[in-house]
Amino acid sequence: TRDVREPPALKYGIVLDAGSSHTSMFIYKWPADKENDTGIVGQHSSCDVPGGGISSYADNPSGASQSLVGCLEQALQDVPKERHAGTPLYLGATAGMRLLNLTNPEASTSVLMAVTHTLTQYPFDFRGARILSGQEEGVFGWVTANYLLENFIKYGWVGRWFRPRKGTLGAMDLGGASTQITFETTSPAEDRASEVQLHLYGQHYRVYTHSFLCYGRDQVLQRLLASALQTHGFHPCWPRGFSTQVLLGDVYQSPCTMAQRPQNFNSSARVSLSGSSDPHLCRDLVSGLFSFSSCPFSRCSFNGVFQPPVAGNFVAFSAFFYTVDFLRTSMGLPVATLQQLEAAAVNVCNQTWAQLQARVPGQRARLADYCAGAMFVQQLLSRGYGFDERAFGGVIFQKKAADTAVGWALGYMLNLTNLIPADPPGLRKGTDFS
C-alpha cells in the first residue's frame, strides 16, 4: 500500500444574476485550503432560468420565484450534498428591477419577497436577495474581469506574490436596461459619486465607474422604436421588408420611454411600422440618445456625466460581446478598428430582411434589431465614452475568461464571501506533492 493524497476539499457559492431580460444562475467553486489565493475561484456550472427577468413578474410575484425552481433543483445536483449547508446563495437584481422599483416600488418589494421565500426553502446558506446599485454592478464586473485575468496579484516562480506590472483592465458591460463603464484612474474624480476606492490584496485602487440607466440594449431599442414612431412613421434601423404591428401601450410602458410618450395616446391602439434599411437615418436616430450640450465638469462622457479620459485596456462583455460576435461570426465582417466597426454597422443596416434571413438562416427572433444594436455600440464607444482608434485597439470583446462568464456575479460573491482579502497575502509555506 501507499499513501494517496486526497484532492483538496472544494467549497461552493451560488449567485443568481437577475437581469432585466432573464435570470442566470452561476455556481462557483474553489479549493477550501486556498481561499485567499487569487484566480482560484472558477465557474463550476451555470443555468439559464427559462422565461423573462424577475421584473416581468410584477403582476405575478409567485411566478418569479417559480421560474427559479428548475435551476435551483439543478444546483442541488451540481453541489455535493455534504456541501449544501455551507454554500452561500445570493440573488442580485439589476436594472430591470431598478426600473420596476422606480415605477412600482410595491411590486418590486413583492417580487423580491416571493423570491426570498422560495430561496429560503433550499438547503443552501441563503444570504439575501437585493437590487444592486448601478455603481455596484459596474465595480463587481470590473473585479470579476481583473480577478479572472489575474491582474491583482500573481504567484511568481520564485515563490512570492507580486502585483503584475500590466495594470488592471477597464470593464464595459451592456445589459438589457443599463450599461456600465468602470476603469482604474490616477486622479480623483470630479464627481465623487463616480469614484470607488478599493483595497485588494494590500493594494489600493481608485476606480471610476458610472452606470447609465435606460442605456441597456433592450431599453435603447425601445427608445429608438418610440423615436421612429414619433419622427418617421417608418424605422430606419429595421431592415426593408420587415413589418410589424406595435401596440402603443407596449412602447410607452417603460420609464425609459416616458419622455417620448405623446400627450394623448391610446395605449390599446395598434400601429403598423416597417423598416427602411437606412444606415444614415439610423445613425441620426441613435445619435439622438446622447446629449453633449452641457457638462458641469472639466470633461464629460454624455448627458452631463463626468468621465476621465479612457485609459488602458478594456474588456467589453454581455451585449457588447454578443453584438460584435454577431458582426464577426454571423455576418463575417471585420471589427478590429472603430472604422471597421462603423462600416460593419452600416453593412448590417443596409441589408434587407430577406438578405438578413439568408445570411443568418434559421434565426428569426431579434434579427431585425442587430442594425440598431451595432449602431448603438459603435456610437456609445466612440462618441459616448470617447474611444479613439488607439484606445479602441485596447478593447477586447469577451464572454468568458478562464472558463468563467465575465459579469458582476463572481465579483459580487468574492466580495460578500471575503474571498479577496484587503491585506496582502504572506509568503506561504507548504508541501510540494509533485
Partner: antibody, heavy 129, light 111 residues
Framework: DIQLQESGPGLVKPSQSLSLTCSVT?????????WNWIRQFPGNKLEWMGY???????NYNPSLKNRISITRDTSKNQFFLKLSSVTTEDTATYYC??????????????????????WGQGTSVTVSS | DTVLTQSPASLAVSLGQRATISCKAS??????????MNWYQQKPGQPPKLLIY???NLESGIPARFSGSGSGTDFTLNIHPVEEEDAATYYC?????????FGGGTKLEIK
C-alpha cells in the same frame, strides 16, 4: 376588414405543377404583411410553405425550396403558389394567410412575434392520376 | 427544424371544467427571455384562428377563459371554464426560428 380567398384546380396529376391563387380584399398586399401559404394534410398536420412579403421578397420552407414559387400580381391584389413535381403526398387543403411581426413586451425586453391572423377558407387539392 | 409534440392527441372535458393541452418543443423556443410560441384554434371546416401569441398574450377578442403559459421547451394552453363553443382542434406554433412549425394538434370534445 381583410379577407382572403383561395382558388385553383381541385385535382392535379402526379409530376405536374399545382397552381393556386389567393385574392386579397380590404388591404393592399404592398402596404404591409407577409402573404403565406400553409397546407393541412389529411391527418390534420399543418405545414408552413412560405411567404411573399409586402415588398416582394420570398421566404420558403427549406423542405420545399426546390419545388415552390410564390409570386404576386399587385395590380390585381393577388398572390400565387406554384408547386412543381407534385406527388400524392402533396394532397392537402391549402390555405393562404396574412402574417406579420407583432411587437410585444416581455419584461422590459420588446420583441417580435410572427403571427398569422387572417386566413382564407382553404381549398382542397387532390393529387391523383 | 423545431419539432412540436402536443399531448394528449384528444381529450374530452365536461362543460365548465378545465382543459389542459401541452406542447413540447424539441429545442428551446426562447430567446432573450421571450417565448416565441403561439396557439391556434381550428373548428371543423374553418381555418385556424389565432388565440395566444408570445406564450401567454391573449389575442384581442379572445375570451379570458383561454390562457397560455410556459417557456423554453414546455408550454401549456388552459381553457377554464370550458364552453360548448370550445370544441375544436388546438395547435401550438413556434416562430423562434425558420421555418415556423406547428404541433400535431389536440382535439377537444365537450362532454
Amino acid at each position: 376588414d381583410i379577407q382572403l380567398q383561395e382558388s385553383g384546380p381541385g385535382l392535379v396529376k402526379p409530376s405536374q405543377s399545382l397552381s393556386l391563387t389567393c385574392s386579397v380584399t380590404g388591404y393592399s398586399i404592398t402596404s404591409g404583411y407577409y402573404w403565406n401559404w400553409i397546407r393541412q394534410f389529411p391527418g390534420n398536420k399543418l405545414e408552413w410553405m412560405g411567404y411573399i412579403s409586402y415588398d416582394g421578397d420570398n421566404n420558403y420552407n427549406p423542405s420545399l425550396k426546390n419545388r415552390i414559387s410564390i409570386t404576386r400580381d399587385t395590380s390585381k391584389n393577388q398572390f400565387f403558389l406554384k408547386l412543381s413535381s407534385v406527388t400524392t403526398e402533396d394532397t392537402a387543403t391549402y390555405y393562404c394567410a396574412g402574417g406579420y411581426y407583432r411587437y410585444g413586451l416581455g419584461s422590459y425586453s420588446g420583441s417580435y412575434y410572427y403571427v398569422m391572423d387572417y386566413w382564407g377558407q382553404g381549398t382542397s387539392v387532390t393529387v391523383s392520376s | 427544424d423545431t419539432v412540436l409534440t402536443q399531448s394528449p392527441a384528444s381529450l374530452a372535458v365536461s362543460l365548465g371544467q378545465r382543459a389542459t393541452i401541452s406542447c413540447k418543443a424539441s429545442q428551446s423556443v426562447d430567446y432573450d427571455g421571450n417565448s416565441y410560441m403561439n396557439w391556434y384554434q381550428q373548428k371543423p371546416g374553418q381555418p385556424p384562428k389565432l388565440l395566444i401569441y408570445a406564450a401567454s398574450n391573449l389575442e384581442s377578442g379572445i375570451p379570458a377563459r383561454f390562457s397560455g403559459s410556459g417557456s423554453g421547451t414546455d408550454f401549456t394552453l388552459n381553457i377554464h371554464p370550458v364552453e360548448e363553443e370550445d370544441a375544436a382542434t388546438y395547435y401550438c406554433q413556434q416562430s423562434n426560428e425558420d421555418p415556423p412549425t406547428f404541433g400535431g394538434g389536440t382535439k377537444l370534445e365537450i362532454k
